[in-house]
């Protein structure tokens, strides 16, 4: 089952700055990501940002910058202008929509240990990444091995002994995994294209996961919308979702110009517009 993980970080340098990281673990194409605070989307939560994999991002105050980090994860920087720091005990929710298969949502908040109200500001704890742990572990084994061999050779010079029986050390026993929520996410750590067939904004693609992410994914609230995609059903390619055939809605008598592969926009298209809608359905 697909999962959504949410992690909220407070910047150690600026206590008024927060970053929300969200990710989608599972197969499928992401058609839209919405980030809200104060509750889940559609349940009283207030929108902070909406991210489309091809058409860009929209954000509302106090959101400062929303961006795609990888094909399946996003980050949202927030600027807390109030002195009381309302973000400290606020719930942030991320909803990953895959139209028409379904949407998955999960929420998270700032860990209590990083409460800005504490006497001392929280210091970020560096988390050893799996690859670094492996390298360090292997280096340690090699150094130890060399030292041990030198020690034996020196002893052999002073006192002749029978043939040496080398001791075997399992270097694998010294490697460590820093973050292993699931097999799917492990594959995604090393090969972001391995398990997730999604689209992204090439300009902002950053396939490397930042150091210091240690929160495990929370189980997503799956809201099935539309026919459930069976294992044998191929997931829709993003190109077919926003296609030239769409026309992306043109006004009467207008022919849309081509604006890129698989995308057609209006002649008067001015990019994302932050419009407060009248479509608040109650």
């Amino acid at each position: 089952t697909p999962e959504v993980w949410v992690q909220v970080q407070m910047e150690a340098t600026e206590l008024s700055s927060f970053t929300v990281h969200c990710g989608f673990l599972g197969p499928g194409s992401i058609s839209l990501v919405t980030v809200s605070w104060g509750g889940p989307d559609g349940a009283g939560g207030t929108k902070l940002a909406v991210l489309h994999p091809e058409l860009g991002t929209r954000q509302w105050a106090p959101a400062r910058q929303a961006r795609w980090e990888t094909q399946s994860s996003i980050s949202l920087a927030l600027e807390d202008s109030g002195a009381s720091s309302p973000f400290a005990n606020t719930t942030f929710c991320c909803k990953f929509a895959s139209f028409p298969e379904g949407s998955w949502e999960s929420c998270g908040s700032l860990p209590p240990s990083s409460d800005p109200g504490l006497s001392a500001p929280p210091t970020p704890v560096p988390i050893l990444r799996a690859d670094l742990a492996g390298i360090l572990g292997l280096s340690g084994v090699l150094l130890f091995g060399c030292g041990y061999l030198l020690h034996l050779l020196r002893r052999q010079k002073h006192r002749p002994t029978p043939r040496l029986q080398p001791s075997h050390t399992n270097s694998q026993a010294l490697t460590a995994q820093a973050w292993a929520p699931s097999q799917a996410s492990q594959a995604a750590l090393h090969d972001p294209y391995a398990t997730i067939n999604t689209s992204f904004c090439p300009a902002t693609l950053d396939t490397a996961h930042p150091n210091g992410w240690a929160s495990l994914p929370t189980h997503a609230a799956h809201q099935p919308q539309g026919p459930a995609a069976s294992a044998s059903t191929p997931i829709l390619a993003r190109g077919s979702f926003v296609s030239v055939e769409n026309g992306l809605y043109t006004q009467a008598g207008e022919r849309p110009p081509h604006t890129g592969p698989g995308l057609t926009l209006f002649p008067d298209c001015r990019g994302p517009r932050a419009v407060e809608g009248r479509f608040g359905v109650r």
Partner: nanobody, 120 residues
């Protein structure tokens, strides 16, 4: 949670008419478009029509002059009047509530879909 329930689909002969309805309930904050998408058998998704928050309807080229999208705010309902139906209009029609990106309505919530079959 937003609930969108479509109705009005069915079998119709070429040249015939159908009226799709979508009843919306729940709560959506800051959504700014409501519309219809469709998916023909074995084909990709296609935006059919949507209404902006400013009330302006927009249509995909292939349905202009044949389809009309309308809204009843009092009933929290969306409609799609489909006239002069063609075989190529056969698809599952989804009612969506979403966000505008330029002049594109990106679905954030949608219904289960209603099947429209145009055949003689």
């Amino acid at each position: 949670e937003v609930q969108l329930v479509e109705s009005g689909g069915g079998l119709v002969q070429p040249g015939g008419s159908l009226r799709l309805s979508c009843a919306a309930s729940g709560y959506t904050s800051r959504t700014d478009c409501m519309g219809w998408f469709r998916q023909a058998p074995g084909k990709g998704l296609e935006g059919v029509a949507h209404i902006d928050s400013d009330g302006i309807p927009r249509y995909v080229e292939s349905v202009k002059g044949r389809f009309t999208i309308s809204q009843d705010h009092a009933k929290n309902s969306l409609y799609l009047q489909m006239n002069s139906l063609r075989a190529e209009d056969t698809a599952v029609y989804y009612c969506v509530v979403g966000f505008k990106f330029g002049d594109y309505c990106a679905p954030n919530d949608w219904g289960q879909g209603t099947m429209v079959t145009v055949s003689s």
